[in-house]
């Protein structure tokens, strides 16, 4: 659920970490009405995720150890 | 009821390796996170990594990186915690721990509700 | 070492209140739920608080947390003996990207 760039609410599904090559942090306080993770896919979707939720906070922290040992 | 039932003391040599077992009962497994913290002798908490076993992917703190092993088996519903290159400094309680709610529901991430007994491992000469 | 700090001992009498500060950055308490955890001697860890201010089924209500900016803390009112316990906050660090737990107060009721 995104309008102009910015997340307006959170998929309700859970993406496979094997599906995901990237995020982009979406911050309440620049310009956006929520703080968001958006997830990037390998089919070239934008998936808005709930950064307070475990499986994101996961997914999060998988990515960014990928990116550093790259 | 769940319960997480942890496999019984170690005493190491440092330089070894040890690994902990702790089966979950009660609930569903997979879609669960599943945390290890350790405690020294008269210290305090320490999270050491985690696993949701459906992601197959652990995630570790970034001081046990290279010498943590966290898997699981959803076969038999355990997670395992495996601990290589021993020493002295790594005597501690290890406890595996589910978190509150599943890995969609929870918004709380790290409220560890269910805690096993604990694993006293002991690294001595 | 931790990130969240705590005082490394509180008290009271019984019947007194409480409170217990538990203080982090804005990458952990600021941005996401605290949890509080009570360690009787000898046992493991028990869930008291998640969530920020939540009670998990079986904790009694004299337990209550809040948080506030980069902050939190537990208040214990009506203190009784078997409260006397290792209490620990615990968030996620979204710059560790990981839990962290905070240093730790013994209660002890006099």
């Known amino acids: 659920a995104s309008n102009f760039d910015c997340c307006l609410g959170y998929t309700d599904r859970i993406l496979h970490p094997k599906f995901i090559v990237g995020f982009t942090r979406q911050l309440a306080n620049e310009g956006c009405d929520i703080n968001a993770i958006i997830f990037h896919t390998k089919k070239k979707l934008s998936v808005c995720a709930n950064p307070k939720q475990t499986w994101v906070k996961y997914i999060v922290r998988l990515l960014s150890k990928k990116v550093k040992n790259m | 009821q769940v319960q997480l039932v942890q496999s019984g003391p170690e005493v190491k040599k440092p330089g070894s390796s040890v690994k902990v077992s702790c089966r979950a009962s009660?609930?569903?497994?997979?879609?669960?996170?599943f945390s290890w913290v350790r405690q020294a002798p008269g210290q305090g908490l320490e999270w050491m990594g985690g696993?949701?076993?459906?992601?197959?992917?652990?995630i570790y703190a970034q001081k046990l990186q290279g010498r943590l092993t966290i898997t699981a088996d959803t076969s038999t519903d355990t997670a395992y915690m495996e601990l290589s290159n021993l020493r002295s400094g790594d005597t501690a309680v290890y406890y595996c721990?589910?978190?509150?709610?599943?890995?969609?529901?929870?918004?709380?991430?790290?409220?560890?509700?269910?805690w096993g007994r604990g694993t006293l491992v002991t690294v001595s000469s | 070492q931790a990130v969240l700090t705590q005082p490394s001992s509180a008290s009271g009498t019984p019947g007194q209140r409480v409170t217990i500060s538990c203080s982090g950055s804005s990458s952990n308490i600021g941005n996401n739920a605290v949890n509080w955890y009570q360690q009787l001697p000898g046992t493991a860890p028990k869930l008291l608080i998640y969530n920020n201010n939540q009670w998990p089924s079986g904790v009694p209500d004299r337990f209550s947390g809040s948080k506030s900016g980069t902050s939190a803390s537990l208040a214990v009112s009506g203190l009784q003996s078997e409260d006397e316990a290792d209490y620990y906050c615990?968030?996620?660090?979204?710059?560790?990207?990981?839990?962290?737990f905070g240093t730790g107060t013994q209660l002890t009721v006099l």
């Open positions: 615990a968030a996620w660090d979204d710059s560790l990207n990981g839990y962290v």
């Open positions: 696993i949701i076993p459906v992601f197959e992917t652990p």
């Open positions: 721990a589910r978190e509150w709610g599943d890995y969609y529901s929870s918004v709380s991430s790290g409220a560890l509700h269910y």
């Open positions: 009660g609930g569903t497994f997979s879609t669960y996170a």
